[in-house]
Interface confidence: low
C-alpha cells in the first residue's frame, strides 16, 4: 500500500507522541555520543516537517523515504567528524548504503558514563518541573546505551517509568515506593535489550531463514493449537517487524507490531486460549503481554511424528517439492509437542533431520537410510539435560555468588584473552541462570536455561566482535547460531595462552570498597578473581578458593578498622605476598 508521503503516513498512524518518541530513539541509537539537547532539536525539526506533510502530502521533500529524511537530518550534525570519526564517511554515501553504514557503526559497548541514580527528591522535582523532558531523557539515555533496544517495547518501559514517578512522588515514603520499581525496570530493561540483541544478531549474521526457524519453533511451542498455516503467517509478520526494528526502521516496526497485535487479538480463537487477558489491555501493554504469554495447552490427540516424517513413503517426495515448507512443518510438529525443549535444541533436531534427508534422499534406498533418524536425536536431547542437571546441582550447593565465581574461573580458562570486564559481566549473567531457571520443574528447566544462555552468550559474541581477541570465541560465535552454547561448553583450558605477569597494582584495594553496594563489591572481587586466573591459568579450584576466602576476610577486616586506608595498605601487601606464595607466582 504505497503512500504519497511515508512520513505523513507514519505520523498519522502512530500519533505525534509516539512519532516523536520513536524518532528520538532512532536518532539516539545511531548517534550515541550526541548531547540530549541536540537530539531534541533534530526530533523537533523532523516533527514539524512531518506535520507539513500531513497537511499537504505533495509538499516539497514529503515523498522522500524515511531513511533519506532521517539520514539527511543526522548528517547535519556539525561535530559528526570530530565525535564519530569515520562514521562521518557514511554521509558521503547514497541510500540505502548510507543507512547500512550507520547500522554498522552502532556500538554495543559505547564509551558512556555509568548512569548514576540521583536522590529520590531530586528525581521527583525534575519529574514535576518538566515531565516531558524527564521522560524524553529516559528514552535517550536507554536508547544510546542499547542501540538495538526494541523500540516499541521501550515505549512500554517509558510508560511504566512515568507511572512509577506519578504514583511514588506523591507517596509518604517516596524512596520505598520508587526504588524497587526502578530496580525492576532496570533489570527487565537489561534482559529485554539482550533478548532483542540476539534477534538482531540472528537476522544480521545468520539471515532471515535462521530467524524464521527460531520463530516457527517458539510460536509453535506457545500456540500448539494453531494450524501450521496460522503459525507461518505469524512468523512472516513477526520477521518483518524485527527486520524493521533491527534495521533502524523504527516507525514502520512500531506500526507493524501494532497491526500484528491487532490481528492476533482478532483471531485469538484460532491461535491460543491464553490471549484473552492480553487482548483487553491498551496497545503497548497488549503487545508486551502477547510477547510474554504462557504456552497454551497441547492438543490432547496429537499423532506420532514418525508417521509423517519417517514411516511415510512420501518423505523424500514431500521434501524435494518444497524443502523449507516440509522442514517448517517438521519443526512446527516437533515444537508443539515439546514445550519442555529449548528452542535451540529443537533447531538442532531440525538441522539433524534436514542433513539426514539431504543424504538419504539421494541414496539407493532412502527409507532404509533415514529409518533410524529419530535415534540420532537422543544424544542431542540428553546433552543439555545432563548439563542443566549438573549445573543446577552446583548452583544449589554454592548459591548464586559462588556459582558465578565457578563460571568465572571456567570461562577465563577457556578464553583468557577476553577482556576482564567482559568476562565478569558475561559470567555474572551466565550465573544468574541458576536463580532464574533451577527453581522450575524439570519440564520448564531446559527452555528457561538454554534459551537464556543463548541470549547471554550472544552478549559475549557482540562485545567480542568489536575487538576480536580470541579465535576460539570467533569460531563458537560464527559457525552455528544454535550450537554456540555446546561450542563454548566443549572448550577446554586454552593451552596456548601466555599468562599475564603478576601486577600488584591490580590487587591493591582502598577504603572506597567499603562504601560500595554488595553487588559492586562482588564485582570488584570477581574482577580480582579473573585477573588471578589470567596470571595463573593452571591454579586449582582449591588454590583460588583459598585466595578468595583470604581476600573476603581482608576486605571485611579493613572495612571494620578505624583507620581503613592504613589497614588496606598494610594488610593488602601481606595478602598479595600470601597469594603469590599460595599460587606459586
Amino acid at each position: 500500500d504505497a503512500h504519497k508521503s511515508e512520513v505523513a503516513h507514519r505520523f498519522k498512524d502512530l500519533g505525534e507522541e509516539n512519532f516523536k518518541a520513536l524518532v528520538l530513539i532512532a536518532f539516539a541509537q545511531y548517534l550515541q555520543q550526541c548531547p540530549f539537547e541536540d537530539h531534541v532539536k533534530l526530533v523537533n525539526e523532523v516533527t514539524e516537517f512531518a506535520k507539513t506533510c500531513v497537511a499537504d502530502e505533495s509538499a516539497e521533500n514529503c515523498d522522500k523515504s524515511l531513511h533519506t529524511l532521517f539520514g539527511d537530518k543526522l548528517c547535519t550534525v556539525a561535530t559528526l567528524r570530530e565525535t564519530y570519526g569515520e562514521m562521518a564517511d557514511c554521509c558521503a554515501k547514497q541510500e540505502p548504503e548510507r543507512n547500512e553504514c550507520f547500522l554498522q557503526h552502532k556500538d554495543d559497548n559505547p564509551n558512556l558514563p555509568r548512569l548514576v541514580r540521583p536522590e529520590v527528591d531530586v528525581m521527583c522535582t525534575a519529574f514535576h518541573d518538566n515531565e516531558e523532558t524527564f521522560l524524553k531523557k529516559y528514552l535517550y539515555e536507554i536508547a544510546r546505551r542499547h542501540p538495538y533496544f526494541y523500540a516499541p517495547e521501550l515505549l512500554f518501559f517509558a510508560k511504566r517509568y512515568k507511572a512509577a514517578f506519578t504514583e511514588c512522588c506523591q507517596a509518604a515514603d517516596k524512596a520505598a515506593c520508587l526504588l524497587p520499581k526502578l530496580d525492576e525496570l532496570r533489570d527487565e530493561g537489561k534482559a529485554s535489550s539482550a533478548k532483542q540483541r540476539l534477534k538482531c544478531a540472528s537476522l544480521q549474521k545468520f539471515g532471515e531463514r535462521a530467524f524464521k526457524a527460531w520463530a516457527v519453533a517458539r510460536l509453535s511451542q506457545r500456540f500448539p493449537k494453531a494450524e501450521f498455516a496460522e503459525v507461518s503467517k505469524l512468523v512472516t509478520d513477526l520477521t518483518k517487524v524485527h527486520t524493521e526494528c533491527c534495521h533502524g526502521d523504527l516507525l514502520e516496526c512500531a506500526d507493524d507490531r501494532a497491526d500484528l497485535a491487532k490481528y492476533i487479538c482478532e483471531n485469538q480463537d484460532s491461535i491460543s486460549s491464553k490471549l484473552k487477558e492480553c487482548c483487553e489491555k491498551p496497545l503497548l501493554e497488549k503487545s508486551h503481554c502477547i510477547a510474554e504469554v504462557e504456552n497454551d495447552e497441547m492438543p490432547a490427540d496429537l499423532p506420532s511424528l514418525a508417521a509423517d516424517f519417517v514411516e511415510s513413503k512420501d518423505v523424500c517426495k514431500n521434501y524435494a517439492e518444497a524443502k523449507d515448507v516440509f522442514l517448517g512443518m517438521f519443526l512446527y510438529e516437533y515444537a508443539r509437542r515439546h514445550p519442555d525443549y529449548s528452542v535451540v535444541l529443537l533447531l538442532r533436531l531440525a538441522k539433524t533431520y534436514e542433513t539426514t534427508l539431504e543424504k538419504c534422499c539421494a541414496a539407493a534406498d532412502p527409507h532404509e537410510c533415514y529409518a533410524k533418524v529419530f535415534d540420532e536425536f537422543k544424544p542431542l536431547v540428553e546433552e543439555p539435560q545432563n548439563l542443566i542437571k549438573q549445573n543446577c546441582e552446583l548452583f544449589e550447593q554454592l548459591g548464586e555468588y559462588k556459582f558465578q565465581n565457578a563460571l568465572l574461573v571456567r570461562y577465563t580458562k577457556k578464553v583468557p584473552q577476553v577482556s576482564t570486564p567482559t568476562l565478569v559481566e558475561v559470567s555474572r549473567n551466565l550465573g544468574k541462570v541458576g536463580s532464574k531457571c533451577c527453581k522450575h520443574p524439570e519440564a520448564k528447566r531446559m527452555p528457561c536455561a538454554e534459551d537464556y544462555l543463548s541470549v547471554v552468550l550472544n552478549q559475549l559474541c557482540v562485545l567480542h566482535e568489536k575487538t576480536p581477541v580470541s579465535d576460539r570465541v570467533t569460531k563458537c560465535c560464527t559457525e552455528s547460531l544454535v550450537n554456540r552454547r555446546p561450542c563454548f561448553s566443549a572448550l577446554e583450558v586454552d593451552e596456548t595462552y601466555v599468562p599475564k605477569e603478576f601486577n600488584a597494582e591490580t590487587f591493591t584495594f582502598h577504603a572506597d570498597i567499603c562504601t560500595l553496594s554488595e553487588k559492586e563489591r562482588q564485582i570488584k572481587k570477581q574482577t580480582a578473581l579473573v585477573e588471578l586466573v589470567k596470571h595463573k591459568p593452571k591454579a586449582t579450584k582449591e588454590q583460588l578458593k583459598a585466595v578468595m576466602d583470604d581476600f573476603a576476610a581482608f576486605v571485611e577486616k579493613c572495612c571494620k578498622a578505624d583507620d581503613k586506608e592504613t589497614c588496606f595498605a598494610e594488610e593488602g601487601k601481606k595478602l598479595v605476598a600470601a597469594s603469590q606464595a599460595a599460587l606459586g607466582l
Partner: nanobody
Framework: EVQLLESGGGLVQPGGSLRLSCAAS????????MSWVRQAPGKGPERVSA????????IYADSVKGRFTISRDNSKNTLYLQMNSLRPEDTAVYYC??????????PGQGTLVTVSS
Amino acid sequence: EVQLLESGGGLVQPGGSLRLSCAASGFTFGQFGMSWVRQAPGKGPERVSAISSDGSGTIYADSVKGRFTISRDNSKNTLYLQMNSLRPEDTAVYYCTIGSSTTPSGPGQGTLVTVSS
C-alpha cells in the same frame, strides 16, 4: 576498527636477518597478548611466537627457538619480531594477531619474507 599493519619483510639470503614490525590501532594494544603467525605457500597458519600484554612472558615455536625474538613497545603500539639465522623454510607471509589467535585479527595483508640464495 582493529588495524594491524605489518612491515619489514623482504628477500634475504640464508643466515641473514630481518626485523618485522606490526603497527596496531583501533584497540587498547597494551591490554592484549600478541602473536606472530606465518603461512607458507600451500600450508596452514603456524604460530611462530607470542608475547604477554606487558611483554614479560614469551613463547616460541620449536622451529624458531634461539633464532627469533619477539618484543613489543606499548608506548608506540608496536609489536616486533627480530629474525636471525634465517633459513629457506622460514619463507612465508608473516602477520601479527591479537591474543593467541592464528587467524588474522585485522585487515593487514601480512609481510612476505623470502629466504633464498
